[in-house]
């Protein structure tokens, strides 16, 4: 099939006291290969420090996968979520608050 | 198919700098991150930095303070620059694709590498 | 940094034996590694990824295997083709970090 882009959207939870976890989900993508990572302050985080779900097709012949990582209140700033996807790339902010959700669909 | 090649200068002086360049074929820097690695004679191997489809970088904290790593995606080329070389910098320099699927990060495929002796 | 060692330096075995190369990390890596194959030329080629994923392309007889902090391939049955130098690497944290190779000779 030919290459459906992905749509990305950061959200952010509760934790623990202090922490947040943020997630970035990509999802209504083709093909598969489609790389997603959290960076601070334009660095690549650690592996274990990111939490991945697998890539799963979602039922319409695209699909969907997440990146989580668990950060400081107050420091939302200084993270993106960054996706790479059948040679296209973009960033992501975390939204500043829990209602706040950034949706992006790139081509 | 995918393929990288490295190419230098062969010998550099102690005290100046080193300039590499990769040159791909066979997918896009745009969507894909390339990795440097080297190898001195007879030791293994040791990664250097790698440069994003997007042009961000990331860099062996050991070395970053001498590392810049750049590309020009229209050339379908990377380039390497170290500073201040000295002897123990005599490596084989590689570069190699970098495969970024959730848990599974892997460096699917190297260039023949190309080799650098600091000496005078 | 990760250190990532590979006890035996080189072996010696013959053509048709199952030979198997152990690698271990300082701290664990939760199956974050990655085996490589070098040849005497310094042709670079990936095997297994993620512990135990075969790459496209190698022969079924290269397996991997391993949890924690120690890990292992395994060559099922030795072919000629098989003379290298093959390297562990971890990419739990950054840096990505390799071991110092084992080299397989023919005996």
């Known amino acids: 099939g030919s290459t459906v882009p992905p749509m990305v959207n950061v959200t952010r939870s509760e934790a623990s006291e202090g922490n947040i976890t943020v997630t970035c989900r990509a999802s209504g993508f083709y093909p598969w290969n489609i790389t997603l990572s959290w960076r601070q302050d334009g660095v690549s985080l650690s592996h274990d420090t990111q939490q991945w779900g697998d890539v799963l097709p979602d039922g319409n012949g695209t699909y969907q996968t997440w990146v989580a990582t668990r950060i400081c209140q107050g420091e939302e700033q200084r993270f993106t979520c960054y996706m790479e996807h059948s040679g296209n790339h973009s960033t992501h902010p975390v939204p500043s608050g829990n209602s706040h959700h950034h949706h992006h669909h790139h081509h | 198919q995918v393929q990288l090649k490295e190419s230098g200068p062969g010998l550099v002086a102690p005290s100046q700098s080193l300039s590499i360049t990769c040159t791909v074929s066979?997918?896009?820097?745009?969507?894909?991150?390339v990795n440097w690695v080297r190898q001195p004679p007879g030791k293994g191997l040791e990664w250097l930095g790698m440069?994003?489809?997007?042009?961000?970088?990331d860099y062996n904290s050991a070395l970053k303070s001498r590392l810049s790593i750049s590309k020009d995606n229209s050339k379908s080329q990377i380039f390497l620059k170290m500073n201040s070389l000295q002897t123990d910098d005599t490596a084989r320099y590689y570069c190699a694709r970098g495969a970024y699927y959730g848990k599974r990060w892997y460096f699917d495929v190297w260039g023949a590498g190309t080799t650098v002796t600091v000496s005078s | 940094d990760i250190q990532m060692t590979q006890t035996t330096s080189s072996l010696s075995a013959s053509l048709g034996d199952r030979v198997t190369i152990s690698c271990s990390a300082s701290q664990g890596i939760s199956n974050y590694l990655n085996w490589y194959q070098q040849k005497p030329d310094g042709t670079v080629k990936l095997l297994i990824y993620?512990?135990?994923s075969l790459h496209s392309g190698v022969p079924s007889r290269f397996s991997g295997s391993g949890s924690g902090t120690d890990y292992s391939l395994t060559i099922s049955n030795l072919e000629p083709e098989d003379i290298a130098t093959y390297y562990c690497q971890q990419y739990s944290k950054l840096p990505p970090t390799f071991g110092g190779g084992t080299k397989v000779e023919i005996k």
């Open positions: 993620y512990t135990s």
């Open positions: 440069i994003w489809g997007d042009g961000n970088t």
């Open positions: 066979g997918f896009s820097l745009t969507g894909s991150g």
